[in-house]
Amino acid sequence: AYYQQLNTELKENLKDTMTKRYHQPGHEAVTSAVDQLQQEFHCCGSNNSQDWRDSEWIRSQEAGGRVVPDSCCKTVVALCGQRDHASNIYKVEGGCITKLETFIQEHLR
């Protein structure tokens, strides 16, 4: 029951966090956590990399033409997030949610 509740909350909150809080002032800890999540779990976006299209930061001029954060890149270099291509970006079926689900299953069960 605990796992199920955690899983539901993750699904509901991760995309919201990524779209509304990522790279926003005062949310540096969230930004850092999302970047770490994407790099360590080799994923991009909540469900897939296209989730980033709804991000307030990605849609703003401040993102410098990025379509995904640089932390989605297999090799992180400045502005690498401008190219949303499988050779460059972690394109995992199910995005970071799937990776997190697997991690939680392995560590909480």
Partner: antibody
Framework: EVKLVESGGDLVQPGGSLKLSCAAS????????MSWVRQTPEKRLEWVAY????????YYPDTIKGRFTISRDNAKNTLFLQMNSLKSEDTAMYYC???????????WGQGTLVTVSA | DIVLTQSPASLALSLGQRATISCRAS??????????MQWYQQKPGQPPKLLIY???NVESGVPARFSGSGSGTDFSLNIHPVEEDDLAIYFC?????????FGGGTKLEIK
């Protein structure tokens, strides 16, 4: 050409309120994050408010929180700063500003002067 | 809050000399290989003007006489050769952690 024009600055008594406006032109306003930065008479620069491009996220330093409210009207290309419970230390030139890409405030208006004094 | 300490508070140089302004942050302003430090120039009666962003990138239209360097907590702005037009106050600013903060400024005077 990017143009930011502030207005609304005035002489106001401590405890009073004031609403500043910033009219933007020459760029796609709705895709730009916006901030208000003020400069005290001693020339010190302070970042006082931020709003995301869509207006979803706002940020205020602790010295400002609860007294000032930043908002925007993307349909009218206008940024606002509602200032309440004004103190003498809020006396400053208030600038409307925005980044171009990445970090740093690339675009600045000419400023509007707010004087809080009895 | 990240405190930025600029030095010197003022400096007077002759034309053609090199100006070096330092900015020290109370915590690192680096993130993902980028130093989130900016430099501005403010002339009398004008708003600040962005010169350098992300520590070393020269803003479009800014003369090559201006350069920025540094990482972590220590940064510097160099102007060489100094020209008459450089008479101004120079500020550093970090955008690593909110609230974004500015240094106290360095006034450059021409001898």
């Amino acid at each position: 050409e990017v143009k930011l024009v502030e207005s609304g600055g005035d002489l106001v008594q401590p405890g009073g309120s004031l609403k500043l406006s910033c009219a933007a032109s020459g760029f796609t306003f709705s895709t730009y994050t916006m901030s208000w930065v003020r400069q005290t008479p001693e020339k010190r620069l302070e970042w006082v408010a931020y709003i995301s491009s869509g207006g979803v996220t706002t940020y205020y330093p602790d010295t400002i929180k609860g007294r000032f409210t930043i908002s925007r009207d993307n349909a009218k290309n206008t940024l606002f700063l509602q200032m309440n419970s004004l103190k003498s230390e809020d006396t400053a030139m208030y600038y409307c500003t925005s980044p171009r890409t990445g970090t740093g405030f690339a675009y600045w208006g000419q400023g509007t002067l707010v004087t809080v004094s009895a | 809050d990240i405190v930025l300490t600029q030095s010197p508070a003022s400096l007077a140089l002759s034309l053609g000399q090199r100006a070096t302004i330092s900015c020290r942050a109370s915590a690192s302003v680096d993130y993902y290989g980028t130093s989130l430090m900016q430099w501005y120039q403010q002339k009398p009666g004008q708003p600040p003007k962005l010169l350098i962003y992300e520590a070393s990138n020269v803003e479009s239209g800014v003369p090559a006489r201006f350069s920025g360097s540094g990482s972590g907590t220590d940064f510097s702005l160099n102007i060489h050769p100094v020209e008459e037009d450089d008479l101004a106050i120079y500020f550093c600013q970090q955008s690593r952690k909110a609230p974004y903060t500015f240094g106290g400024g360095t006034k450059l005077e021409i001898k």
